[in-house]
């Protein structure tokens, strides 16, 4: 019985060349979070492990920074960074919770942040 929910930053947009923070928050469960994975489509961006700390995938280490918290900061954004991002919470004893964020990188200097929403 998985009772938790993941709240994310939802659909967000940012300027090309800028940076953005991807954030997820797991609530409504007392489960122990053992690890959080950040993925873009099928690519692993980073892992934050409760014991071992952060690991950034080598191919992203120049543009991805850990934090704040269990979030992830994407830097030097390009239009190719547009797409879906997933935070995957590995927990005991519940198992895995996944949150989704859609990022749109705009050429324009007018980039507005979307509203927060919840994914059960």
């Amino acid at each position: 019985m998985m009772t938790g929910t993941i709240e994310t930053t939802g659909n967000i947009s940012a300027e090309k060349g800028g940076s953005i923070i991807l954030q997820c928050h797991l609530s409504s469960t007392t489960a122990q979070v053992t690890q959080v994975n950040w993925e873009q489509q099928d690519q692993l961006l980073a892992i934050c492990n409760a014991d071992l700390g952060w690991h950034i995938s080598p191919s992203f280490k120049d543009r991805v920074a850990p934090g704040p918290g269990l979030g992830l900061t994407l830097q030097s954004l390009t239009v190719n960074d547009t797409g879906e991002y997933f935070c995957i919470y590995h927990t005991y004893p519940d198992g895995t919770y996944t949150g989704r964020i859609f990022l749109e990188v705009l050429e324009s200097s007018v980039a507005e942040h979307g509203a927060r929403f919840q994914i059960p």
Epitope: T3, T30, T34, A50, P93
Partner: antibody, heavy 120, light 108 residues
């Protein structure tokens, strides 16, 4: 073998304060959730407070009867957890146990307890 | 708050007999979050069973646990003298974590 040793208990008047300490040895303290559980004389067990890991931003939770009066904290560099108890009431009289928990390792160790007596 | 009610409050049995201790929750508890502890006089509680049915390290296999939802049971197939103690069920499924009031298993 992991050992937990509580200290700081004693006799205090209603409205007074005490600070309980729990020192851990024999393990990587920072990897464990820490809890305080109390047991009034001749009564059952009551969970009091929990503090999680740096990984969880040191999230804390309390039983309703102590919210606003008790504060749990930890110092991973000293392998210690604390319970600051203010505005003590006679019903806070109990043996206070420190517990060290790692759910996914099925690890659950208790100290021997320290007696807090609130009486005029 | 999830209230755990244990029954009976006291169970008087003789060594060699079978003991059945019950724990009833006021609302559903996931079986992974239901633990049992044993406590002897003057000592701290000790984890006895975790996740409803798994014996903690060093616990003899005459002990077993079962249950789901709101009803859980600790069973001792054949009582040994060292089994006489107080047993508490415990849930960490939701805050505040709670314990049952305990079942005292005493020698008849």
């Amino acid at each position: 073998e992991v050992q937990l040793v509580e200290s700081g208990g004693g006799l205090v008047q209603p409205g007074g304060s005490l600070r309980l300490s729990c020192a851990a040895s024999g393990s990587t303290f920072s990897n464990y959730w820490m809890n305080w559980v109390r047991q009034a004389p001749g009564k059952g067990l009551e969970w009091v407070a929990e503090i999680r890991l740096k990984f969880n931003n040191y999230a804390t939770h309390y039983v309703e009867s102590v919210i606003g009066r008790f504060t749990i904290s930890r110092d991973d560099s000293k392998n210690s957890v604390y319970l600051q108890m203010n505005s003590l009431k006679t019903e806070d009289t109990a043996v206070y146990y420190c517990t060290m928990v790692r759910r996914n390792w099925y690890f659950d160790v208790w100290g021997r307890g320290t007696l807090v007596t609130v009486s005029s | 708050e999830i209230v755990l009610t244990q029954s009976p409050a006291t169970l008087s049995l003789s060594p060699g007999e079978r003991a059945t201790l019950s724990c009833s929750a006021s609302s559903s508890v996931s079986s992974s979050y239901l633990y049992w502890y044993q406590q002897k006089p003057g000592l701290a509680p000790r984890l006895w069973i975790y996740s409803t049915s798994n014996l903690a390290s060093g616990i003899p296999d005459r002990f077993s646990g079962s249950g789901s939802g709101t009803d859980y049971t600790l069973t001792i197939s054949r009582l040994e003298p060292e089994d006489f103690a107080v047993y508490y069920c415990h849930q960490w499924s939701s805050y505040p974590y709670t314990f049952g009031q305990g079942t005292k298993l005493e020698i008849k």
